[in-house]
């Protein structure tokens, strides 16, 4: 059941100052974990595990909780004030330019290169040329060209919202 709180229920120091464009003092901002009512007079609680709001707001609706995809693990559940935190499973990572999905980490570096960074939930293994020390980025090499290594363990969570 959604709880209902009014601006008057908030302690004076918590009460949000109404925005200038608003005419009524009751039409201010609602605290995290709530959204504003249709008439702007009340704050309505988000539903735990279903939706959330992270900041003081005048949102008509709370935001839908993210559901972790297959290939992801849930590090922390959605609460009324914080979205779900999902992380790629061990051996996979999420790139900045394709945040929708976790990709498999490479199992090793091309011949002539050495691994200097492990697979993490947010990065592939890192390879550098033995001689020059320059980083390698490109296609996954053919199997016979690889030096195998096991995926690294996660170091810290990678949060995705929405």
């Amino acid at each position: 059941e959604s709880a209902l709180i009014t601006q008057q229920d908030l302690a004076p120091q918590q009460r949000a100052a109404p925005q200038q464009k608003r005419s009524s003092p009751s039409e201010g901002l609602c605290p995290p974990g709530h959204h504003i009512s249709e008439d702007g007079r009340d704050c309505i609680s988000c539903k735990y595990g279903q939706d959330y709001s992270t900041h003081w707001n005048d949102l008509l609706f709370c935001l839908r909780c993210t559901r972790c995809d297959s290939g992801e693990v849930e590090l922390s559940p959605c609460t009324t004030t914080r979205n779900t935190v999902c992380q790629c499973e061990e051996g996979t990572f999420r790139e900045e330019d394709s945040p929708e999905m976790c990709r498999k980490c490479r199992t090793g570096c091309p011949r002539g290169m050495v691994k200097v960074g492990d697979c993490t939930p947010w990065s592939d293994i890192e390879c550098v040329h033995k001689e020059s020390g320059t980083k390698h980025s490109g296609e996954v090499p053919a199997v016979e060209e690889t030096v195998t290594s096991s995926p690294g363990t996660p170091a810290s969570p990678c949060s995705l919202s929405g």
Epitope: H35, D58, L59, L60, F61, L63, R64, G162
Partner: nanobody, 123 residues
Framework: EVQLLESGGGLVQPGGSLRLSCAAS????????MSWFRQAPGKGLEFVSA????????YYADSVKGRFTISRDNSKNTLYLQMNSLRAEDTAVYYC?????????????????WGQGTLVTVS
């Protein structure tokens, strides 16, 4: 990204009814709050109605309250606006929009996606 396409507009007599549809494609429709805006000839954009991601919460502008009903079918990726007791002042191009939420005044929260609009003429 979400693509939105409105349909269902047309010419109707005062007191008549129309049902607008907004078909969504692309990213998960059910993650988004949806809304209808309208723009009358020579006027600005007006926030008409909005609905949350699962259809449990709805908002209506005073000008349409009791006459318009917003709904959504997440299994069909479609938003609807049932318009009854239409008046001449409802004549406008109607746009659907998707966003994570909408603020009390209608401003989308986060990235917003818009349809091309469908014309409703009440005459």
């Amino acid at each position: 990204e979400v693509q939105l396409l409105e349909s269902g507009g047309g010419l109707v007599q005062p007191g008549g009814s129309l049902r607008l549809s907004c078909a969504a494609s692309g990213r998960a429709f059910s993650n988004y709050a949806m809304s209808w805006f309208r723009q009358a000839p020579g006027k600005g954009l007006e926030f008409v109605s909005a609905i949350n991601w699962n259809g449990e919460n709805r908002y209506y502008a005073d000008s349409v309250k009791g006459r318009f009903t917003i709904s959504r079918d997440n299994s069909k990726n479609t938003l609807y606006l049932q318009m009854n007791s239409l008046r001449a002042e409802d004549t406008a191009v109607y746009y659907c929009a998707a966003a994570l939420s909408f603020r009390l005044g209608g401003e989308p929260y986060g990235d917003a996606y818009w349809g091309q609009g469908t014309l409703v003429t009440v005459s």
